[in-house]
């Protein structure tokens, strides 16, 4: 079942999952200047059994030059100053994690993708946060979010992370200096 | 929570034109793209373009190109759908959509009338 | 374009029965085909995407399945509330196109 809304925003921080559920879509963005391609599909899908999952649908990007589109008029920033959402990321994810059953590794970037990864997750997704670059992280509980449904409503739990402006950079799990694992850390519950 | 939440009933005369907004809450706006759909009794439901807020870039309904204008706000988190040169065929409920089609607005129903 | 065919306009159960809407598309869409419930008076609302994915808060009676052209909507234990139209729509490819729905009434 599809999360309603999209994980709780972190002041000066960012997430990402180390593996999908079976369920999660990831939109077919491009980059300024392409679009999806109009046969193509709106979104991969993670896909499959308990034993093999897999993203079903690619995602191909043409340039939108060669499209019946208009440009807007109210046209963003090239960059944001901030991603508030999943950055493009390295296929690479540890072992444990993406070989989970029902789960999907980050699929590989695919030509003229957008910088900024959009998903649409699904209950029971957790994902991880850290500071940007230029931040560090007090943590007053685990810096990550779950999707749970709790009386028919999708909510996200609300990860205990403070980022502050100081320059050090806390990691994803796997990466250099990992946070404490995330088993037998108290959940942060909101009541409904 | 995500909500869509369009402007109100319209009643307007044959060859004027007609502008409905469509007002985004609960998620980023410029990460989503926001689609338009007619429903006419007895003629279904049909998709009459989309708009990518964050990116600008629009695609119609070869149908529709021409009838409909889709714009977006990206600053009061709005997506704009102008009708024009309009006609009893343009009389039905008009929803917008977002997050692949997962919500819609209430509708704008919009009768066209001497 | 991908015409989405509803061959059947409307549909009568009664409470507690399975009932199966089918939805055929005019080319190979693969799973990229939704189902929407519509109530009197009211936008529709999204049931399944993907073919066989349910959202949050749609209960499981509801079963979606197919690819490729042909498409099923079940609705296992029919309950007097599932009284209304059913859509599918295909989103393979521009413009995206929906089926002329099948109202469900129940005896």
């Known amino acids: 079942e599809l999360c309603d809304d999209d994980p709780p925003e972190i002041p000066h921080a960012t997430f990402k999952a180390m593996a999908y559920k079976e369920g999660t879509m990831l939109n077919c963005e491009c980059k300024r200047g392409f679009r999806r391609i109009k046969s193509g599909s709106l979104y991969m899908l993670c896909t499959g059994n308990s034993s093999h999952s897999s993203w079903d649908n690619q995602c191909q990007c043409t340039s939108s030059a060669t499209r019946n589109t208009t440009k807007q008029v109210t046209p963003q920033p090239e960059e944001q100053k901030e991603r508030k959402t999943t950055e493009m990321q390295s296929p690479m994810q540890p072992v444990d994690q993406a070989s989970l059953p029902g789960h999907c590794r980050e699929p590989p970037p695919w030509e003229n993708e957008a910088t900024e990864r959009i998903y649409h997750f699904v209950v029971g997704q957790m994902v991880y946060y850290q500071c940007v670059q230029g931040y560090r992280a007090l943590h007053r509980g685990p810096a990550e979010s779950v999707c749970k449904m709790t009386h028919g409503k999708t909510r996200w739990t609300q990860p205990q992370l403070i980022c502050t402006g100081e320059m050090e950079t806390s990691q994803f799990p796997g990466e250099e200096k990992p946070q404490a694992s995330p088993e037998g850390r108290p959940e942060s519950e909101t009541s409904c | 929570q995500v909500q869509l939440q369009q402007s109100g009933a319209e009643l307007v005369r044959p060859g004027t034109s007609v502008k409905m907004s469509c007002k985004a809450a609960g998620y980023t706006f410029t990460n989503y793209w926001i689609g338009w759909v007619k429903q006419r009794p007895g003629h279904g439901l049909e998709w009459i373009g989309d708009?990518?807020?964050?990116?600008?870039?629009?695609d119609y309904n070869e149908k529709f190109t021409g009838k409909a204008t889709l714009t977006a706000d990206t600053s009061s988190s709005t997506a704009y759908m102008q009708l024009s040169s309009l006609t009893s065929e343009d009389s039905a409920i008009y929803y917008c959509?977002?997050?692949?089609?997962?919500?819609w607005g209430q509708g704008t129903l919009v009768t066209v009338s001497a | 374009d991908t015409t989405v065919t509803q061959s059947q306009k409307f549909m009568s159960t009664s409470v507690g029965d399975r009932v199966s809407v089918t939805c055929k598309a005019s080319q190979n869409v693969g799973t990229n085909v939704a189902w929407y419930q519509q109530k009197p008076g009211q936008s529709p609302k999204a049931l399944i995407y993907s073919a066989s994915y349910r959202y949050s808060g749609v209960p499981d009676r509801f079963t979606g399945s197919g690819s490729g052209t042909d498409f099923t909507l079940t609705i296992s234990n029919v309950q007097s509330e599932d009284l209304a139209e059913y859509f599918c729509?295909?989103?393979?490819?521009?413009?995206?196109?929906f089926g002329g729905g099948t109202k469900l009434e129940i005896k």
């Open positions: 959509v977002s997050r692949n089609f997962a919500k």
């Open positions: 708009i990518h807020p964050g990116g600008g870039y629009i």
């Open positions: 729509q295909q989103y393979n490819s521009y413009p995206y196109t």
